[in-house]
Amino acid sequence: QSPIFGPQDVSSIEGNSVSITCYYPDTSVNRHTRKYWCRQGANGYCATLISSNGYLSKEYSGRASLINFPENSTFVINIAHLTQEDTGSYKCGLGTTNRGLFFDVSLEVSQVPEFPNDTHVYTKDIGRTVTIECRFKEGNAHSKKSLCKKRGEACEVVIDSTEYVDPSYKDRAILFMKGTSRDIFYVNISHLIPSDAGLYVCQAGEGPSADKNNADLQVLEPEPELLYKDLRSSVTFECDLGREVANDAKYLCRKNKETCDVIINTLGKRDPAFEGRILLTPRDDNGRFSVLITGLRKEDAGHYQCGAHSSGLPQEGWPVQAWQLFVNEESTIPNSRSVVKGVTGGSVAIVCPYNPKESSSLKYWCHWEADENGRCPVLVGTQALVQEGYEGRLALFDQPGSGAYTVILNQLTTQDSGFYWCLTDGDSRWRTTIELQVAEATKKPDLEVTPQNATAVIGETFTISCHYPCKFYSQEKYWCKWSNDGCHILPSHDEGARQSSVSCDQSSQIVSMTLNPVKKEDEGWYWCGVKEGQVYGETTAIYVAVEERTRGSPHINPTDANARAKDAPEEEAMESSVREDENKANLDPRLFADEREIQNAGDQAQENRASGNAGSAGGQSGSSK
């Protein structure tokens, strides 16, 4: 007997799709070897139609795929647009030739069934409404009208014109006539369920003069759409349930053992397992909505269903749409920290991966909010103004070509705790979710700036010092001036290598920044930070106020004001006359043309991308000593 297992018989109808799962023994060799699907010929030869090596036959072009799921020890063959020519004997198997391990599968594709001429076929989805049309002659205009359902030889009345309704059709079936029509009556059956399917007979009159019509009702269960997503990527379920449920509560549920467990609904219910990584967005007034889930996990794989009902819960006889989500563990999206911890007053540097093939894409960072159906207002972006409340403490540093950008948030408070999303206007799969946890600080911050009340006087020299601990000794220290389009690192150069020191004096590690002479436009936020290459670390921020020298006020000697800096043997100073053209930039409204859940933070449109790139020092000059 073959160790490969799968469906022995698969039957479908023309135009449909099939998804055939083949199971193989869980060994390393099996997980990595070639998987194939071939058609058995009369001569005993099995012709490959598709394989995991990338081969795809001409007859399967554009309509088939083979996907390996090594973590489940399965592979799936999807074939769409079936025709009767697809009927035949097949093998799914493993190995370098088609004679290896295999399982025989019989596929039968039938024509859409035909009925006698007098039978009208009605095809409806679960939860929908069917209107059965019943014609009669004038002689039966005043006779009793009825609709019955065939059960073997018997025909059980569903509804009739004497107002009888079968209990199982109560509140679902109505019999009516339209306008002045004297030769047709109609029966509506709403909230269709699978057991409603079958042959119906409508009748006007009694005995041999009665007019009869046959109706075959087919109630289709939702054909799940197959979705294949990578681990850590995102998925969007687009749900279109029709206008008739436009005003009912919507939900997305995941089929479980006993029930379909609601993940999110429009009444505010949300599964804690999806906290911080789910958004439900109404698309229009016709009942369309979408659910976006980011940071896909292995356990997210499964059967999902969206639906509508006033309770916000799945109900039999209400329209649904279905998906089967597969999560591929062999992901192109790198593993990044899902939880980042910080302390009050401190800072965090969050690394956001993006598709390295799209280095020119616009990068964004948004804050997931739990209210209503979840939303994610953009806080910062490469072409978006920093949102109110984040000025001077939030910046995005793009690192073109590295496949990642860094978002730095400092002056942390406990209110900053929550979920944040990294996203771009490019590949929508590359959306990562980070949970930021901010705890109360129990010790002094690693970086401290003096003086803490920084007021510079126009025309004078102003120096601020940043004290850092020995653990940052080998790291690159920098000062940058914060603006709405990033934090622009102030230029510096080392005048000779610093003397290496075996011991490190905790009190003498200082990096200073000097403004000489101070200009009005020097006012603003400055950051002191540490980094190693492209990896950003701790930062601290200080606001430098600039004022006119008042007549009669003493001229403060900057050397005295920064006496501590003067004595520092390990001092690194930067002197800069900084000119900042604050390019006001705005999030392109086309970015989420169909994803309004991620809100635009900008309020000033600008056609061109901001010219200053975070981390660049273009247009600035200065010296260090």
Partner: nanobody, 126 residues
Framework: QVQLVESGGGLVQAGDSLRLSCAAS????????MGWFRQGPGKEREFVAT??????????YYTDSVKGRFTISRDNAKNTVYLQMNSLKPEDTAVYYC?????????????????WGQGTQVTVSS
């Protein structure tokens, strides 16, 4: 909840046929697959056959020992699944259980089935 009721079991001679039925009621709209398992005297419960569906597409799975002899089918309108058993052998003697699943990753695994019937006895004498 889904309720399952089996019928059609009995005592037959080797080589004879039997047709088992499993009628489902309750929240049947949630089901995705239905199958048959059996438990012979002193043995563990084992997979026999399962039918899963997706719209108008059916997938039928069988254990090796019944291939070509047993056929599983379903009547959607009646919410009923059948197991047609031909060329019965004494080793087919067992209690046959009907099972239904809302989510099925591997149809052979017992723990993937959410609902079970009470079972119907099939005895094949030689």
């Amino acid at each position: 909840q889904v309720q399952l009721v089996e019928s059609g079991g009995g005592l037959v001679q080797a080589g004879d046929s039997l047709r088992l039925s499993c009628a489902a009621s309750g929240r049947t709209f949630t089901t995705y697959g239905m199958g048959w398992f059996r438990q012979g005297p002193g043995k563990e419960r084992e997979f026999v056959a399962t039918i899963t569906w997706s719209g108008s597409t059916n997938y039928k799975y069988y254990t090796d020992s019944v291939k070509g002899r047993f056929t599983i089918s379903r009547d959607n309108a009646k919410n009923t699944v059948y197991l047609q058993m031909n060329s019965l052998k004494p080793e087919d003697t067992a209690v046959y259980y009907c099972a239904a699943s809302t989510v099925l990753t591997d149809p052979r695994r017992l723990n993937e089935y959410d609902y079970w019937g009470q079972g119907t006895q099939v005895t094949v004498s030689s």
